[in-house]
């Protein structure tokens, strides 16, 4: 299982919110699936809290790529038979530690509620639930404790009296080869898959089954909770889109269907048709990461958290990638330093957001007859012949780059340079070879280079694309 911000919901954060070290606990609560009880009702099927909880420490601005979560399983013992259909409530609680923790020692970070159908003895069922900005990944299964076996844990097994066989009329207990089915206390013939009993000689049916021995699928008219009959009346199936599909109840509220509509049972601190109204007040300290609580003096007025730069969300719980808003103008590079944003500006621009277009030529004309040229978001000096540098103040040696090809000699001149070409060459830079037969002059291949090997070229090209 894992617990952390969902995809696209910001950098995974330590859950401590800069309030010192803390621990996470998970509280699992099971309620009867058919009940219309309010969310705050008792966990009638059982409840348990996770153990072996690691301590997290918060380093401001640091992220935690994955939260090391409480080890091991959360075991919820349930009494009597397993009902098969149930409501699963998982709450994630944070406990603040240390002498300077301040505020309430316990905070409910997230709460997921879902209705589930599960037979005992089956494999692990995997689930992902998102609530607000948090995502909870978990697996669950129902197991019978010996001597109980079966989908409802209603059949009992006893250790074999003899190593080779079970007593007269008793079958081996299939999951436990060393055990035998106990003498039936249920009504004879009661379906072992769909029936169970809590008293001798009774046969109580799991949801979707009926009849004295729980062998008859529930008929169309008696499918419960908006379920519809399956093919060839094999039982009741979950319906198509219903009022509770997608859980319209916000903030961890649980949804129940009522005559074609829905009803939300809201957790403490929330109310409204969809549990969308928060009854939390500023006195509850709902703003994390230095957020300031505004309004919300009483439960009837909603609070708002004003978040410090770099945080967002209704409780300032979500870190923002402020560079994603592209605040740097004119192609500036954005740097989110945590405490502040910085823009590294391209040449020719300045200001905190690179918003100022610098005019490099203003008040600083190019020297020695140079002219100011704009282009590519910056300005530069185009220097007259014989000058160079940023302001054209440096005398340039036009022959420094050895511009005359094929052994031509370079001479500096007030207007630039002149090449005196070696015999057999001509042109401004001695770039043309003169053919002795009087044919046209052709460009000479530069010395030191040869024709590219086509195979090598193709090989390199192929490699480049991998």
């Amino acid at each position: 299982h894992s617990f952390g911000p969902g995809p696209g919901l910001g950098t995974p954060r330590s859950p401590c919110n800069a309030r010192g070290p803390c621990r996470l606990f998970f509280r699992v609560c099971l309620k009867p699936g058919v009940s219309q009880e309010a969310t705050e009702s008792l966990c009638a099927l059982g409840a348990a809290l996770s153990t072996s909880v690691p301590v997290y420490t918060e380093h401001p601005g640091e992220s935690a790529a994955a939260l090391p979560l409480p080890d091991g399983l959360v075991r919820v013992p349930f009494r009597d038979a397993w009902p098969g259909t149930f409501s699963l409530v998982i709450e994630t609680w944070r406990e603040q530690l240390g002498e300077h923790a301040g505020g309430p020692a316990w905070n409910l970070l997230a709460r997921v509620v879902g209705r589930r159908r599960l037979a005992a003895g089956g494999p692990w069922a995997r689930d992902v639930q998102r609530t607000g900005t948090w995502e909870l990944h978990f697996s669950y299964r129902a197991r019978c404790e010996p001597p109980a076996v079966g989908a409802a844990c209603a059949r009992l097994c006893r250790s074999r009296s003899a190593p080779s066989r079970c007593g007269p009329g008793l079958r081996p207990c299939t999951p436990f080869p060393d055990e035998c089915e106990a003498p039936s206390v249920c009504r004879p013939g009661c379906s072992p898959e769909h029936g169970y009993c809590e008293e001798p000689d009774e046969c109580r049916c799991l949801e979707g089954w009926t009849g004295p021995l729980c062998t008859v699928p529930v008929s169309t008219s008696s499918c419960l909770n908006s379920r519809v009959p399956g093919p060839a009346s094999t039982g009741c199936l979950l319906p198509g889109p219903g009022p509770c599909d997608g859980n319209p109840c916000a903030n961890g509220g649980s949804c129940s269907e009522t005559s074609g509509s829905f009803e939300c049972a809201c957790p403490r601190g929330f109310y409204g048709l969809r549990c969308e109204v928060s009854g939390v007040t500023c006195a509850d300290g709902p703003c994390f990461n230095g957020g300031l609580c505004v309004g919300g003096e009483d439960p009837d007025s909603a609070y708002v958290c004003h978040c410090p730069p770099g945080f967002q969300g209704s409780n300032c719980e979500k870190r923002v990638d402020r560079c994603s808003l592209q605040p740097c103008q004119n192609g500036g590079l954005c740097l989110d330093l945590g405490h502040a944003l910085r823009c590294r500006c391209r040449a020719g621009f300045a200001g905190p957001r690179c918003e100022h277009d610098l005019d490099d030529c203003a008040g600083r004309a190019c020297a020695n007859g140079g002219t100011c040229v704009e282009g590519g978001g910056s300005r530069r000096c185009s220097c007259a012949l014989g000058f160079g540098g940023r302001d054209c103040r440096e005398r340039a040696d036009p022959c420094a780059s050895r511009p005359c090809a094929h052994g031509g000699r370079c001479y500096a001149h007030f207007s630039g340079l002149v090449c005196a070409c070696a015999p057999g060459y001509m042109g401004v830079r001695c770039e043309f070879a003169v053919r002795p037969d009087g044919a046209d002059a052709v460009p000479a291949a530069p010395r030191g280079l040869r024709q590219a090997d086509p195979q090598r070229f193709l090989h390199h090209h192929h490699h480049h694309h991998h």
Epitope: G102, L292, C293, H306, P309, H339, P352
Partner: antibody
Framework: QVQLQESGPGLVKPSETLSLTCTVS????????WTWIRQPPGKGLEWIGY???????NSNPSLKSRVTVSLDTSKSQFSLNLSSVTAADTAVYYC????????????WGQGTMVTVSS | EIVLTQSPGTLSLSPGERATLSCRAS???????LAWYQQKPGQAPRLLIY???SRATGIPDRFSGSGSGTDFTLTISRLEPEDFAAYYC?????????FGGGTKVEIK
Amino acid sequence: QVQLQESGPGLVKPSETLSLTCTVSGDSISNYYWTWIRQPPGKGLEWIGYIYYSGTTNSNPSLKSRVTVSLDTSKSQFSLNLSSVTAADTAVYYCARVFNRGFAFDIWGQGTMVTVSS
Amino acid sequence: EIVLTQSPGTLSLSPGERATLSCRASQRISNTYLAWYQQKPGQAPRLLIYGASSRATGIPDRFSGSGSGTDFTLTISRLEPEDFAAYYCQQYDTSPLTFGGGTKVEIK
């Protein structure tokens, strides 16, 4: 080095509007919330209001109906307007930067004394 | 609003002594969002402590903050001559932001 400088008239007549401007240098005004605080002579500090470049503002309910805080990112300035002033508004007015780990105030201007008198 | 009460109003001590300043809130400050400031005559306040116990940048370690809930303390372990000033606490948990009335630390 971030610096804040308050400016505005030192004397305002009763019932008029007190207007002050704070110029921010050394950092982008978009990086932080910015606030106004005042201190009457010989007394304690009173928070007036704050603003963020996104438009978020908040002010003290005891002054709310009279306070307007605004911000001009292009000039790197934020301003305070306090209407219908009385002698009780005589104070040193400070502009300050709101700390990025919570709404404390980590950098302050040197303050400007405003007297309300006819 | 959260009212902050500072005590004592004035604290007379000698250099080298330990100063303990108290700040009490009228209601719980849920997230330890409390700051301490120092103010010298004719100057703007200076942030010393935020989050009840974290020192601001450049603040000497003789200044320390503690407390949670409604009771907070600023301690100056050994008073230096430059520490004689007024000290204010401020909560930033809930709007409106409020300051305490101040404690003046004077030379005995």
